[in-house]
């Protein structure tokens, strides 16, 4: 992940920049949340461990018609080395637990801020 092409990016983006931009977008989503995010859609919870970017994308890609998270979906695809499509699931999903998109975003944001603080950009 040393050459991440961010959304509308003119060229390769350092991992630290890509992660910071993802955090900025998640902050923006939580800040501007007036009505229930994505009409209260539910997604599979994930284990926030190695491979979580693909797992997060696999969860969020199943939410359709929600413009608020489209940029996040595109950004996450830059962190995931393989193509992700709707209906795809990895072992990182907690398959018996569904949570609201808003909670999913909050949990992901909290974890990414921790990674950023610790310098874990990949």
């Amino acid at each position: 992940l040393t050459c991440l092409g961010g959304f509308a990016s003119p060229g390769p983006v350092p991992p630290s920049t890509a992660l910071r931009e993802l955090i900025e977008e998640l902050v923006n989503i939580t800040q501007n949340q007036k009505a229930p995010l994505c009409n209260g859609s539910m997604v599979w919870s994930i284990n926030l461990t190695a491979g979580m970017y693909c797992a997060a994308l696999e969860s969020l890609i199943n939410v359709s018609g929600c413009s608020a998270i489209e940029k996040t979906q595109r950004m996450l695809s830059g962190f995931c080395p393989h193509k992700v499509s709707a209906g795809q699931f990895s072992s990182l999903h907690v398959r018996d637990t569904k949570i609201e998109v808003a909670q999913f975003v909050k949990d992901l944001l909290l974890h990414l801020k921790k990674l950023f603080r610790e310098g874990q950009f990949n």
Epitope: R20, E21, I23, E24, E25, N28
Partner: antibody, heavy 121, light 107 residues
Framework: EVQLVESGGGLVKPGGSLRLSCAAS????????MNWVRQAPGKGLEWVSY????????YYADSVKGRFTISRDNAKNSLYLQMNSLRAEDTAVYYC??????????????WGQGTMVTVSS | DIQMTQSPSSLSASVGDRVTFTCRAS??????LGWYQQKPGKAPKRLIY???SLQSGVPSRFSGSGSGTEFTLTISSLQPEDFATYYC?????????FGPGTKVDIR
């Protein structure tokens, strides 16, 4: 040396305008979100505005929304605050402070020395 | 908006005293909190980041603790240069908010 230096303060009449600048040096300015914070004479600190690294996300305190505009020029390592429709209650020392989306050890770690804005007729 | 309250608002202490300030947030801010020292006519100086991490170059007599909604700043042995006003800042969500400050003066 990591440094932020504000300028542009002064005396202005109510309803007037002023543009503050903050010149950054000693660090990669484009990698940091930036903020303006103010302090009225004898009062506490009040956050004014935030701008993300690439200008994508901007936030304001309710007290200045619609009157103040934050901007940055990464090529010039500079942060700006355009202040319009100034009121007496905007009288304060204005500081710029660097940040990294509240995510890191760099959040609000470096501050400028401040520039005084006085709004009075 | 997240409200920050600080107690006490002021305190008188002597050199060598152990002093503790409290900062409370109106909602959970995880550890997105910093502590700042400000002396008259000067810019704030950060002492603690991420609620409990000591800023580089800051003496070890300063320490921070807490997470969620309740936070403390402790000076283990007050020095003459520590007489100042101390502010907490939450940078968890916008608008960022400062506590009203705690002024420490000489008893």
């Amino acid at each position: 040396e990591v440094q932020l230096v504000e300028s542009g303060g002064g005396l202005v009449k109510p309803g007037g305008s002023l543009r503050l600048s903050c010149a950054a040096s000693g660090f990669t300015f484009s990698s940091y979100s930036m903020n303006w914070v103010r302090q009225a004479p004898g009062k506490g600190l009040e956050w004014v505005s935030y701008i993300s690294t690439s200008n994508s996300y901007i936030y304001y305190a309710d007290s200045v929304k619609g009157r103040f505009t934050i901007s940055r020029d990464n090529a010039k390592n500079s942060l700006y605050l355009q202040m319009n429709s100034l009121r007496a209650e905007d009288t304060a020392v204005y500081y710029c402070a660097r940040d990294q989306v509240g995510a890191t050890l760099d959040a609000f770690d470096i501050w400028g020395q401040g520039t005084m804005v006085t709004v009075s007729s | 908006d997240i409200q920050m309250t600080q107690s006490p608002s002021s305190l008188s202490a002597s050199v060598g005293d152990r002093v503790t300030f409290t900062c409370r947030a109106s909602q959970d801010i995880t550890d997105d909190l910093g502590w700042y020292q400000q002396k008259p006519g000067k810019a704030p100086k950060r002492l603690i980041y991420a609620a409990s991490s000591l800023q580089s170059g800051v003496p070890s007599r300063f320490s921070g603790s807490g997470s969620g909604t309740e936070f403390t700043l402790t000076i283990s042995s007050l020095q003459p240069e520590d007489f100042a006003t101390y502010y907490c800042l939450q940078h968890n969500s916008y608008p960022f908010t400062f506590g009203p400050g705690t002024k420490v003066d000489i008893r």
